[in-house]
């Protein structure tokens, strides 16, 4: 009974039906199933296609632009569970732009374990209002079901028996509407007694075993489940995998040799992106979690002492990093066995990219050479570099070599960075923006002071075009409001006051107080700081009443911490000696203000004396939210409730239906009760600001989803004819 067929990998079936036959023997798809972009298929192509063995999909099911497909009832008649281990943009079931789909027809679908449902832009799709999604998944409020034929009330959804005046299908209440539940005109929705929870029940309504999920052939027997709530092991459902088994992919138990085979298959394969599976916490998982390293004898993840080491041996003993691509080859390395030559002339978002790829390097066994790297402003992307051994040296016995770096202004932030150079000398020439004080500081910190000879550090070609600030600017006044920060600082005048061109104020959002001046900067225009140029103040002849320069920062975010510093802008003096001043980086938080409104309020009455309210926090809390205020007001009962004959056939119960989150314009149009429709004289009220805002948010949300969908599903054709689909970055 339990998963009678094979376990198949995730599939991406597109363009034509050829590969659909690979589903033939699959009981479980371990991954996602995407069927999409079939423009030439017709209804008759699907007539004899059926995959009755398919019981479960572990990730998500996505159907997108498959022409001619009118129902899924024959295609997947026994699909019972979609686990949603990995989701497609928060969704486990996505039916999007299926132009000919008339009904879902997944009449055995009993459980979507994680994630929600997105059914959108399906012009012919009916039988949506007849499905009670709350019986299938928990987070119904996150479902997004809009712009289908069902919205336009053009569907004549008839459940089994209705044509003959019978009600064969169970009815449930949603938003006060008591509706028969069915998937198609011939298939009811199976609704189990509430006590069965999600375990499922037999046709007679007897609950399945607590380890079952969705359905079973006999009650209270873990070997007779259709799918398992937790884990599957040798024909039965179990709560957890007993030794010597390991949990795999969140749904089944596997033995050590299974995990080992996966590990070796990948190790011996040349295919990029495969995983060398390991064992951790009784699970067979793709890789060790952060802070663990694999013990190669038993595949177990063991805690690293300190950061996990990854030794990278360089071919020919050295490697030149001349682009982000070449830096990516060292991603994750902690120890470099060899020497590094950095020669970066340009690129996008360099500082961040270099840190992402080289930021874990702690040790270089040879030398480090920074040569003609015009794009570099700082070496702080080597965030963890602590040791240069100098076991091999650059010609001239140099273990650190910096030549002709036109924009290099900082080596590291020496107040936070320790670097030891075991042997070898320093070489600095033609680094015009690198102040000598920065180089001398490196000599002290790295323990190389006294090793250098006279010409190793050029006095004339380092820092000759820099404003080597030797004075500290101090802030004299700081004031905040919810969207402004006012700063003033002590006056600064160079020996010749005409040399002061003004000040540069740098600021950026900084959630943590760990920012350095050169974070995120490179010479190609990337700069995470906002920079303001400020004119010098009027110079007073009275030294006692010098004007304090300042700036009012406007348009800031409430309740947000900013990192701020200011430095002088001075001209180069004739003697090639430049002056200047700079403040420390300070952190200032704007004040709190009123939060934006709570989002997506939902009200449901669960009894005659109770209303349950749910809402999401505001998008802009603008401070620490301590409590919410709920206001309510009793309203006069609708007189129609007393006047109606409730025995009238076909009468829909009048109800105040609540609007689910992200309700579309179309569904709002058709949410009016039939009494309003029949009047025909009422004009629609103008939209409120909140409605307009909601529609804008809705439109933006829809665009985001569509962009995501298009980015994921449209991939360039492969030249080789591979069978496995590329993994499309699910969430």
């Amino acid at each position: 009974h339990l998963y009678p067929g094979e376990v198949c990998p995730g599939m991406d079936i597109r363009n034509n039906l050829t590969r659909l036959h690979e589903l033939e023997n699959c009981s479980v798809i371990e991954g996602h199933l995407q069927i999409l972009l079939m423009f030439k298929t017709r209804p008759e192509d699907f007539r004899d296609l059926s995959f009755p063995k398919l019981i479960m999909i572990t990730d998500y099911l996505l159907l997108f632009r498959v022409y001619g497909l009118e129902s899924l009832k024959d295609l997947f008649p026994n699909l019972t569970v979609i686990r949603g281990s990995r989701l497609f943009f928060n969704y486990a079931l996505v039916i999007f732009e299926m132009v000919h789909l008339k009904e879902l027809g997944l009449y055995n679908l009993m459980n979507i374990t994680r994630g929600s449902v997105r059914i959108e832009k399906n012009n012919e799709l009916c039988y949506l209002a007849t499905i009670d999604w709350s019986r299938i998944l928990d987070s119904v409020e996150d479902n997004y079901i809009v712009l289908n034929k069902d919205d336009n009330e053009e569907c004549g959804d008839i459940c089994p028996g209705t044509a003959k005046g019978k009600t064969n299908c169970p009815a449930t209440v949603i938003n006060g509407q008591f509706v028969e539940r069915c998937w198609t005109h011939s298939h009811c929705q199976k609704v189990c007694p509430t006590i069965c929870k999600s375990h499922g029940c037999t046709a007679e309504g007897l609950c399945c075993h607590s380890e079952c999920l969705g359905n079973c052939s006999q009650p209270d027997d873990p070997t007779k489940c259709v799918a398992c709530r937790n884990f599957y092991l040798d024909g039965r459902c179990v709560e957890t995998c007993p030794p010597p088994y390991y949990h795999f992919q969140d749904w089944r138990c596997v033995n050590f040799s299974f995990c080992q085979d996966l590990h070796h298959k990948c190790k011996n394969s040349r295919r990029q992106g495969c995983h060398q599976y390991v064992i951790h916490n009784n699970k067979c998982i793709p890789e060790c979690p952060s802070g663990y390293t694999m013990n190669s004898s038993n595949l177990l993840c063991t805690p690293c002492l300190g950061p996990c080491p990854k030794v990278c041996h360089l071919l020919e003993g050295e490697k030149t990093i001349d682009s982000v691509t070449s830096a990516q080859e060292l991603r994750g390395c902690t120890v470099i066995n060899g020497s590094l030559i950095i020669n970066i002339r340009g690129g996008n978002n360099l500082a961040a990219e270099l840190e992402a790829n080289l930021g874990l390097i702690e040790e270089i066994s040879g030398y480090l050479k920074i040569r003609r790297s015009y794009a570099l402003v700082s070496l702080s992307f080597f965030r963890k570099l602590r040791l240069i051994r100098g076991e091999t040296l650059e010609i001239g016995n140099y273990s650190f070599y910096a030549l002709d770096n036109q924009n290099l202004r900082q080596l590291w932030d020496w107040s936070k960075h320790n670097l030891t150079i075991t042997q070898g000398k320093l070489f600095f020439h033609y680094n015009p923006k690198l102040c000598l004080s920065e180089i001398h500081k490196m000599e002290e910190v790295s323990g190389t002071k006294g090793r250098q000879e006279r010409n190793d550090i050029a006095l004339k070609t380092n820092g000759d075009q820099a404003s080597c600030e030797n004075e500290l600017l101090k802030f004299s006044y700081i004031r905040t409001s919810f969207d402004k920060i006012l700063l003033r600082w002590e006056p600064y005048w160079p020996p010749d006051f005409r040399d002061l061109l003004g000040f540069m104020l740098f600021y950026k959002e900084a959630p943590y107080q760990n920012v350095t001046e050169f974070d995120g900067q490179d010479a190609c225009g990337s700069n995470s700081w906002t920079v303001v140029d400020i004119d010098p103040p009027l110079r007073s002849n009275d030294p006692k009443s010098q004007n304090h320069p300042g700036w009012l920062m406007r348009g800031l975010k409430p309740w947000t911490q900013y990192a701020i510093f200011v430095k002088t802008l001075v001209t180069f003096s004739d003697e090639r000696r430049t002056y200047g001043a700079k403040s420390d980086i300070i952190y200032v938080q704007t004040d709190a203000t009123n939060p934006s409104v709570p989002l997506d309020p939902i009200s449901v009455s669960n009894s005659s004396s109770q209303i349950i309210l749910k809402w999401k926090p505001p998008s802009d809390p603008n401070g620490n939210i301590t409590h919410y205020l709920v206001f309510w007001e009793r309203q006069a009962e609708d007189s129609e409730l007393f006047e109606l004959d409730y025995c009238l056939k076909g009468l829909k119960l009048p109800s105040r239906t609540w609007s689910p989150p992200f309700e579309s314009e179309d569904s709002q149009k058709h949410n009016q009760s039939e009494y309003e429709d029949s009047a025909g004289e009422c004009c629609s009220c103008p939209k409120t600001d909140s409605q307009i805002l909601k529609e804008l948010e809705e439109s933006s949300f829809r665009k985001t989803f569509e962009d995501y969908l298009h980015n994921v599903v449209f991939v360039p054709r492969k030249t080789s004819s591979g069978t496995g689909a590329e993994d499309p970055r699910p969430s």
Epitope: Y477, R479, S481, K484, L486, R488, D535, P549, G550, W551, L552, R554
Partner: antibody, heavy 118, light 108 residues
């Protein structure tokens, strides 16, 4: 009716000190930022100092920094300006004015004259 | 020397329209709302216009304000003898209140 009444002005020698007061009534004093503005004889208006409603922020003009201190006592609905190391150029009529930060001064007192002369 | 420049004097006959200018820079008028004050002889200043063009209650609609770029102006139409006074513009510059030098309006 909003009323602001300054007091404490007078004749003082250079280098001397003086403390001005401003008694407020007709509004919730503790909710408003308060300011001192001065006007030298025959000259224009010059902002001197401001203090926020809770006294969290106190600001003074560059010309008086280090010599003048603004303070307030919300329980007494009174604003103060402590003036030390007075100079001849501090001679002026000193007005107390109500006005929020980065906003306008909506109510003014009648002013008190401070004369610094030997 | 004020950072906001006003003409020292202006004049007009009763019933005439008079305009007083106030010129500054991008860091003050360009970055702040302009307020105008009237100071009748021997009295304290009084708020006349705030936020560039708004009038407090009690101020006649003969007084109007405007701002463009780094300059602002105060217009008085239907001039009356009781309008004879000093007029000051005021803005905020880096958190400091700054006044113009003042314009003495004479009603001929």
């Amino acid at each position: 009716e909003v009323q602001l009444l300054e007091s404490g002005g007078g004749l003082v020698q250079p280098g001397g000190s003086l403390r001005l007061s401003c008694a407020a009534s007709g509004f919730t004093f503790s909710s408003y930022e308060m300011n001192w503005v001065r006007q030298a004889p025959g000259k224009g208006l010059e902002w001197v100092s401001s203090i926020s409603s809770s006294s969290r922020y106190a600001d003074v003009a560059n010309s008086v920094v280090g010599r003048f201190t603004i303070s307030r006592d919300n329980s007494k609905n009174t604003l103060y300006l402590q003036m030390n190391s007075l100079r001849a150029e501090d001679t002026a009529v000193y007005y107390c004015a109500r006005g929020e930060w980065l906003d306008h001064f909506d109510y003014w007192g009648q002013g008190t004259l401070v004369t610094v002369s030997s | 020397q004020s950072v906001l420049t006003q003409p020292p004097s202006a004049s007009g006959t009763p019933g005439q329209r008079v305009t007083i200018s106030c010129s500054g820079s991008s860091s003050n008028i360009g970055n702040s709302a302009v307020n105008w004050y009237q100071q009748l002889p021997g009295t304290a200043p009084k708020l006349l216009i705030y936020d560039n063009n708004k009038r407090p209650s009690g101020v006649p609609d003969r007084f109007s304000g405007s701002k463009s770029g780094t300059s602002a102006s105060l217009a008085i139409s239907g001039l009356r003898s009781e309008d004879e006074a000093d007029y000051y513009c005021q803005v905020w510059d880096s958190g400091t209140a700054v006044f113009g030098g003042g314009t003495k309006l004479t009603v001929l």
